[in-house]
C-alpha cells in the first residue's frame, strides 16, 4: 500500500524558519504535490504550495521556497514573520497526487518538545484518501 | 467559464465602512486564492491581501492592515471586503481576481468596483 | 518587500511594428514574473506567467524573457487593440506590482 511521510523541522539558525518534508512512498509516477497547513487540502486546510513534475511549482506566504528533493519527496521552507511561532502548534499535511494509485496524504506536526535543528520523526498519520 | 462579478460603484461619505462583494462562478470557489488589488486615478495597481476560501485564511499588504477585512460567504462562492473609515484616499477601483496557482497569479478578474469617497 | 522597476512608463510605437518594456526587481525573483494588460473601465488581463508562459488564449505576438532580477516584455505585429497599460507582477514572495507602461498605438 502506498504511503505518504511527514517531516517538520525547526532551523537551528533561524528560529523563525521551519521546513516540511514530504514523501511518497509506493509505485507510479508522481503527477502533483499539494501542501497545505491547519488541515488537509479541500478539508479546511490552507494551501501553502503546488509541486508538478513538468508545470513547475507555486507557494504562498509564509511558504518561501518549495522544490523536489527526489523524484518523490519535496521540501518546503516557510519564515514565520510574526512575533511568536504559529508553526511549532500546526498540522501540515501533503497530498501525493500518482497514477495509478490516485490521491493518498498524510500529516505531521513539529514535535512539542522539539530543539532546534531536530526534525519529527516519519509521521504516517495517513489520511488514505484514494480519491 | 469562470467569471468574477463584483458590486456596483459606490458613492459614501467620509468616516464610513463598505462592503464590496465579488461573486465567483465557473470553479470550485473553496480550491482558489481570492485577491483584491486597488487602483487610485491615474495611478498604477496595488495588492491589498488574499483570502483562501477553503480555510478563511488571509494575508495582507502591511499598508492594508487595519483598512481592509477580507472575508467570504463558501454557500454563495462571495468574497466580501470591508473597507472601513473611509477617507478620500481611498476613492480608487477595486478588483477582485483569482490566483489560477500553476495556472499563474491573478488569471481571472472582475470587473472593478469604484468606490467615490466625498462629502 | 519585493520592489519591481519597470520602465519605460510611456511610449509610442507604430502599428506592425514592436516594443519591448523592462522590469527589474530589487531581489532574485526566481522567474515568478508575470505580465497584464489592462484597458480603461475593464478589468486587467493576464498575458504571461513565469517569465515566459502564454496564458491560454494569448496569441504568441506577447513574449517574456528573463531571470535573476531582470525581465522584459515584448509585443510584435502591433495591432490598434494593444493599446493599453501593461504591468509586470512579482509572485516569487507576496505580490508586486511594477509602476505600468502606457502604449500609444500610431
Known amino acids: 500500500t502506498p504511503e505518504v511521510w511527514v517531516q517538520v523541522q525547526m532551523e537551528a539558525t533561524e528560529l523563525s524558519s521551519f521546513t516540511v518534508h514530504c514523501g511518497f512512498l509506493g509505485p507510479g509516477s508522481i503527477s502533483l504535490v499539494t501542501v497545505s497547513w491547519g488541515g488537509p487540502d479541500g478539508a479546511g486546510g490552507t494551501k501553502l504550495a503546488v509541486l508538478h513534475p513538468e508545470l513547475g511549482t507555486r507557494q504562498w506566504a509564509p511558504a518561501r521556497q518549495a522544490r523536489w528533493e527526489t523524484q518523490s519527496s519535496i521540501s518546503l521552507a516557510l519564515e514565520d514573520s510574526g512575533a511568536s511561532s504559529p508553526f511549532a502548534n500546526t498540522t501540515f499535511c501533503c497530498k501525493f497526487a500518482s497514477f495509478p494509485e490516485g490521491s493518498w496524504e498524510s500529516c505531521g506536526s513539529l514535535p512539542p518538545s522539539s530543539d532546534p535543528g531536530l526534525s519529527a520523526p516519519p509521521t504516517p498519520v495517513p489520511i488514505l484518501r484514494a480519491d | 467559464q469562470v467569471h468574477l462579478q463584483q458590486s456596483g460603484p459606490e458613492l459614501v461619505k467620509p468616516g464610513a465602512s463598505l462592503k464590496i462583494s465579488c461573486k465567483a462562478s465557473?470553479?470550485?470557489?473553496?480550491?482558489?486564492?481570492l485577491n483584491w488589488v486597488k487602483q487610485r486615478p491615474g495611478q498604477g495597481l496595488e495588492w491589498i491581501g488574499w483570502?483562501?476560501?477553503?480555510?478563511?485564511?488571509?494575508f495582507y499588504n502591511e499598508k492594508f492592515k487595519g483598512k481592509a477585512t477580507l472575508t467570504v460567504d463558501k454557500s454563495s462562492s462571495t468574497a466580501y471586503m470591508l473597507l472601513n473609515s473611509l477617507t478620500s484616499e481611498d476613492s480608487a477601483v477595486y478588483f477582485c481576481?483569482?490566483?489560477?496557482?500553476?495556472?499563474?497569479?491573478?488569471?481571472?478578474w472582475g470587473q472593478g468596483t469604484t468606490l467615490t469617497v466625498s462629502s | 518587500d519585493i520592489q519591481l522597476t519597470q520602465s519605460p512608463s510611456s511610449l509610442s510605437a507604430s502599428l506592425g511594428g514592436k516594443v519591448t518594456i523592462t522590469c527589474k526587481a530589487s531581489?532574485?525573483?526566481?522567474?515568478?514574473i508575470a505580465w497584464c494588460q489592462h484597458k480603461p473601465g475593464k478589468g486587467p488581463r493576464l498575458l504571461i506567467h513565469?517569465?515566459?508562459t502564454l496564458h491560454p488564449g494569448i496569441p504568441s505576438r506577447f513574449s517574456g524573457s528573463g531571470s535573476g532580477r531582470d525581465y522584459s516584455f515584448s509585443i510584435s505585429n502591433l495591432e490598434p487593440e494593444d493599446s493599453a497599460t501593461y504591468y509586470c507582477?512579482?509572485?516569487?514572495?507576496?505580490?508586486?506590482f511594477g509602476g505600468g507602461t502606457k502604449l500609444e498605438i500610431k
Open positions: 481576481t483569482r490566483d489560477g496557482g500553476l495556472r499563474g497569479p491573478f488569471d481571472y
Open positions: 465557473g470553479y470550485t470557489f473553496t480550491d482558489y486564492y
Open positions: 483570502i483562501f476560501p477553503g480555510s478563511e485564511s488571509t
Open positions: 531581489q532574485d525573483i526566481n522567474k515568478y
Open positions: 513565469y517569465t515566459s
Open positions: 507582477l512579482q509572485y516569487d514572495y507576496l505580490l508586486t
